[in-house]
Interface confidence: medium
């Protein structure tokens, strides 16, 4: 295996080009050995890194042995040397995180990038006057998005004394006695508490109790799901993977697909059904961002679905990334309004709740009161809606979601960009004309996609009269997968939105809705309504009904207010 | 056996368009990240864009930035590079490459299959 072979396989100047290391397996064509493509003083070529490039944000980073960037932002370096590089700083006043592409052959803040050729970002701490300062660099993909303060310290590793000692120096031992005690009561807290979640898998108890604030626990009997929602909420770091055997592929979307899968129990042959959205290795960002968004506590709602637990897994195929939630067997709206034709008092339910997911997920606070990060979704539709046992909605999908964070500057905001699916864009997201002062303008986009939605569960609304076949909005105006172009004629230049028949107004509660809906997708986005308004129109829709003593689908509705559907 | 072969090259007047298309075969296409890569007569490689397997995120150079088009079609395994205004310095070999799977890569060693390289000349 020598020259000749290259030669004869590879175009000559890129063998010129490279330098000769190893040999090539025989049944590779045209392959590269990984040594090849390097720069060094033999000149062969470097290809540029990507790394995450945020500049400076304000970090929660804080005595963790590694952190995420949690920077959404991946660059490809503009020139071929430079590495990435992460920069933790902490002063009186906060911390903050920095990452950028930079030359190692020039000096970063004064210093030299040392570990420049790591594969992985390990933190040394440099000196500067009035602040702690780290710095790492490293040069593999997205490195810096995964910043490690201590390689020695594992979380199964006693020794920590001697990883603080070499950190904080003697001078620290008062403090650390203190701190030790905290870590050691922490950690037979989380060991009592791993016990009391493993006995409420083992039971498969569906009773669910959910800590809204310190003097807000609502325990809730719920049989819409099967999952133990004590479990909720959390990112399992343990090396144990959960006992998931995936069944069916039940739906494939741009960045991932879902399966139905049966999560075992440890003792017996029972399981609880459970979704399993895995990602391939190359949307990692796509997963960080729905899995950041439910670990939030707070984001626990009846109509957002339920999180059970997000994982990375090794598989053959290589790196996987899965998030564990509930499993809801009627599938996304979209599947349901293709195969039923739904009542009014469905219509209510679906249209109410989903109104309400929306307003809790717009919201800065939990219906407890506690202060709560509002979130956007940027993608409604009605297959990111699932439809659960009681025909009421809950959303997921949170792959473009944005978190309305205070700190984020308008450039923060516009680098989020155009994103969603085209059909359900607002005028305002096709034009690129979004008010970016006013996060608001984010929520108002959700609203013309709730809109839009809402006309189609009513277009399915057996009250109005004949009900057609399924049609998702602007249906038989676009394709299928319409472009952004295609709906800009249509929604900008024609003003054009889904048709609503005269037909339809005759049922006094279809009016209504077909008027909430109206004023939710018009074209300025001031004069929308606000999600929690539409759920209040819900409730008054509701409280109308009751006091006419029937739905207008001739289906009685007791006087208490309870429905009795059996579907 | 992995085959990467490109197409579509050929002469072009300055501020005209070309298509490249890369057609793979031999691995699993929806697994990889792609890139076209090009080499200008006398000068070293350099790279040009990246797309994602899924969810078709792109990157580019610079110097391509707005003028340059990637994408992929998955179900017919292709890669493609809608090339517009041409200029003469984007006379070169492209060359499509495959990424190494996984994040074993670093910025010394991405590819492990490549083209043999379509020659785009723009000349007047």
């Known amino acids: 295996m020598g020259r000749g072979l290259l030669r004869g396989l590879w175009p000559l100047h890129i063998v010129l080009w490279t330098r000769i290391a190893s040999t090539i397996p025989p049944h590779v064509q045209k392959s590269v050995n990984n040594d090849m493509i390097v720069t060094d003083n033999n000149g062969a070529v470097k290809f540029p890194q990507l790394c995450k490039f945020c500049d400076v944000r304000f970090s929660t980073c804080d005595n963790q042995k590694s952190c995420m960037s949690n920077c959404s932002i991946t660059s490809i370096c503009e020139k071929p040397q430079e590495v990435c590089v992460a920069v933790w700083r902490k002063n009186d006043e906060n911390i903050t995180l920095e990452t950028v592409c930079h030359d190692p052959k020039l000096p970063y803040h004064d210093f030299i990038l040392e570990d420049a050729a790591s594969p992985k970002c390990i933190m040394k701490e440099k000196k500067k006057p009035g602040e702690t300062f780290f710095m790492c660099s490293c040069s593999s993909d997205e490195c810096n998005d995964n910043i490690i303060f201590s390689e020695e310290y594992n979380t199964s590793n006693p020794d920590l004394l001697l990883v603080i000692f070499q950190v904080t120096g003697i001078s620290l031992l008062p403090p650390l006695g203190v701190a030790i005690s905290v870590i050691i009561i922490f950690y037979c807290y989380r060991v009592n508490r791993q016990q009391k979640l493993s006995s409420t898998w083992e039971t498969g108890k569906t009773r669910k109790l959910m800590e809204f604030s310190e003097h807000c626990a609502i325990i809730l009997e719920d049989d819409r799901s099967d999952i133990s929602s004590t479990c909720a909420n959390n990112i399992n770091h343990n090396t144990e993977l959960l006992p998931i055997e995936l069944d069916t592929l039940v739906g494939k979307g741009r960045f991932a697909e879902v399966y139905k899968a049966k999560l075992k129990q440890n003792t017996s042959e029972q399981f609880e059904t459970v979704a399993v959205k895995i990602f391939p290795y190359e949307e990692y960002a796509s997963w960080k961002t729905e899995k950041d968004i439910f670990s939030d506590i707070n984001l626990k709602h009846e109509n957002i679905l339920q999180f059970l637990t997000a994982e990375e897994r090794k598989t053959e195929l290589g790196k996987q990334y899965w998030l564990i939630t509930a499993f809801h067997a009627k599938g996304n709206l979209q599947e349901y309004l293709t195969r039923h034709v739904i009542s009014w008092e469905d219509l209510r339910k679906l249209g109410s709740s989903l109104a309400r997911g929306i307003a809790h997920l717009h919201s800065d606070h939990t219906p407890c009161g506690r202060p709560k990060m509002p979130i956007v979704h940027r993608d409604l539709k009605s297959s990111n809606i699932l439809v659960k046992n009681d025909l009421t909605c809950c959303l997921c999908d949170f792959g473009l979601s944005l978190r309305l964070d205070p700190t984020l500057s308008v450039d923060d905001l516009a680098n989020s960009g155009q994103v969603g699916t085209a059909r359900y864009m607002a005028p305002e997201v096709l034009e690129s004309r979004m008010n970016l002062e006013n996060v608001e303008s984010f929520k108002q986009t959700d609203v013309y996609s709730m809109a839009l939605v809402l006309w189609e569960m009513t277009s399915r609304c057996n009250a109005v009269g004949e009900v057609k076949d399924y049609e998702p909005p602007f249906g038989s105006k676009v394709r299928e997968h319409p472009c952004v172009e295609s709906m800009k004629d249509n929604v900008l230049r024609d003003r054009g939105r889904p048709e609503i028949p005269s037909f339809w107004l005759n049922h006094q509660g279809i009016q209504m809705v077909c008027e909430t809906l109206t004023e939710c997708w018009d074209h300025d986005p001031e004069a929308r309504l606000t999600a929690q308004c539409v759920a209040e129109r819900f409730s008054e829709l509701e409280h109308l009904d009751r006091l006419s003593g029937r739905s207008c689908s001739e289906e009685k509705i007791p006087e208490d207010g309870s429905l009795n559907t059996t579907k | 056996e992995v085959q990467l072969l490109e197409s579509g090259g050929g002469l072009v007047q300055p501020g005209g368009s070309l298509r490249l298309s890369c057609a793979a075969s031999?691995?699993?296409?929806?697994?990889?990240r792609m890139w076209w890569v090009r080499q200008a007569p006398g000068k070293g490689l350099e790279w040009v864009s990246a797309i994602e397997p899924i969810g078709n995120r792109t990157y580019y150079a610079d110097s391509v930035k707005g003028r340059f088009t990637i994408s992929r079609d998955n179900s017919k395994n292709t890669l493609y590079l809608q090339m517009n205004s041409l200029r003469a310095e984007d006379t070169a070999v492209y060359y499509c490459?495959?990424?190494?799977?996984?994040?074993?890569?670093?910025?010394?060693?991405?590819?492990?299959?490549w083209g043999q390289g379509t020659l785009v000349t723009v000349s007047s």
């Open positions: 490459a495959k990424q190494i799977p996984g994040r074993k890569w670093t910025a010394n060693s991405r590819f492990d299959y």
């Open positions: 031999g691995f699993t296409f929806t697994e990889y």
